[in-house]
């Protein structure tokens, strides 16, 4: 058959010191008068005992029933419950995306940049020893790299054979930031991302 909720508030004395009994499904709750606390309103309320301040905030009693939380840097709210979003003032460089931290922020960097603020250039020539093929020389540049091809070879990575005999011209390719974004960042090649 159907279960009927017992109204615990029908039984007097659950809530002490003038507390109001509130019936809940399968339970009840006491709403205490100012100055009392606890499940049955049976304890005296002391503002900072225990401290309601979280995230390392320090409690200061400001009156008989009032308190103030002095929050650590990076937190706000009456009990320091909110982590302040540091991203509105972020300075992530070179296409970095801001990730909020505690009283700071970090930057998720595109593959060719690293460091907390994406200000450090990744040396693609170290990262990819075979970036330039067929004896080509890899030259690291800010935000990318270039290949200097030996005679007879051409192309982005010196993989194209020059058939027309115009081998006196070395082909230099410089990877631009926008090409990196299109070729790597938006195609899910996130293995070079630096998370802090």
């Amino acid at each position: 058959g159907s279960e009927t909720d017992v109204n615990e508030c029908d039984i007097p004395g659950h809530c002490q010191h003038g507390g109001t009994c509130l019936n809940l499904p399968g339970s009840y709750q006491c709403q205490c008068l100012q100055g009392f606390t606890g499940q049955y309103c049976d304890s005296l309320y002391v503002p900072c005992a225990p401290s309601p301040c979280v995230n390392g905030g320090t409690c200061r009693q400001t009156g008989d029933f009032t308190f103030e939380c002095n929050c650590l840097p990076g937190f706000e709210g009456s009990t320091c419950e909110r982590n302040i979003d540091d991203c509105p003032n972020h300075r992530c460089q070179n296409g970095g995306v801001c990730v909020d931290g505690v009283n700071t922020y970090n930057c998720r960097c595109p593959p060719q940049w690293t460091g907390q603020f994406c200000t450090e250039d990744v040396d693609e020539c170290l990262l990819q020893p075979n970036a330039c093929q067929n004896g080509g020389t890899c030259a690291n540049r800010n935000g990318g790299y270039g290949c200097v091809c030996v005679n007879g070879w051409s192309g982005d990575d010196c993989s194209e054979n020059i058939d027309d005999g115009n081998s006196g011209l070395n082909d230099i390719f410089e990877a631009q930031k926008i090409e990196w974004h299109e070729n790597l960042y938006f195609q899910g090649h996130h293995h070079h991302h630096h998370h802090h």
Epitope: R91, Q93, G95, G96, P110, F117
Partner: antibody
């Protein structure tokens, strides 16, 4: 060669408006944060406003002293940064510099500056 | 806002002297500090970024150091062209803030 050239400064009465321009060349404009910094005569440098780059949706930040009065914007097709200044006050009198944020948390290129004088 | 305390406000020195300028920030700026040189009637010029990195074309007599909240600019051997005003600037977060400046004068 990276170049920034400001224009649009001049004499304006308190409460008036002025629009500064900064024409840039020698770099891909949309890749960089751009800043306006000002300097009153004989005083130090004061940051005014910034517009982030394309990767950061060209989002904008202002100093408290100019918020709701000044507007920073850019026209990528003209490679030009702007600063629309409204409700000008005498304390806005300064040389206004346009600068590029070079991707190193520092302003690596500056214009020659344009003088704004707010006086009745 | 991050407060920048630059000292001294002025210094008198002779050619060949070693000059040190300090900058203290009100909170950790994670080495996001730059130093600029400005001469009368001219635009500021970037000398140092990232607290210690020398900008291209800047003479090696200029050096920067520091971390956290304390930073230093050193001119190892002052040259005639170095007499100018120097500013520190934090680039960690907006609003960007500058030190009050240090005027390096001829003794």
């Amino acid at each position: 060669e990276v170049q920034l050239v400001e224009s649009g400064g001049g004499l304006v009465q308190p409460g008036g408006s002025l629009k500064l321009s900064c024409a840039v060349s020698g770099f891909t404009f949309s890749d960089f944060y751009m800043e306006w910094v000002r300097q009153a005569s004989g005083k130090g440098l004061e940051w005014v406003a910034a517009q982030r780059n394309k990767a950061n949706d060209f989002s904008i930040v202002y100093s408290a002293s100019v918020k709701d009065r000044f507007t920073i914007s850019r026209d990528d097709s003209k490679s030009t940064l702007y600063l629309q200044m409204n409700s000008l006050k005498t304390e806005d009198t300064a040389v206004y510099y346009c600068s590029r944020d070079g991707g190193r948390l520092a302003l690596d290129a500056w214009g020659q500056g344009t003088l704004v004088t707010v006086s009745s | 806002d991050i407060q920048m305390t630059q000292s001294p406000s002025s210094v008198s020195a002779s050619v060949g002297d070693r000059v040190t300028i300090t900058c203290q920030t009100s909170e950790d700026i994670y080495s996001g500090l730059a130093w600029y040189q400005q001469k009368p009637g001219k635009s500021p010029k970037l000398l140092i970024y990232g607290a210690s990195r020398l900008q291209d074309g800047v003479p090696s007599r200029f050096s920067g150091s520091g971390s956290g909240t304390d930073y230093t600019l050193t001119i190892s051997s002052l040259q005639p062209e170095d007499f100018a005003t120097y500013y520190c600037q934090q680039g960690f977060k907006y609003p960007l803030t500058f030190g009050g400046g240090t005027k390096v004068e001829i003794k």
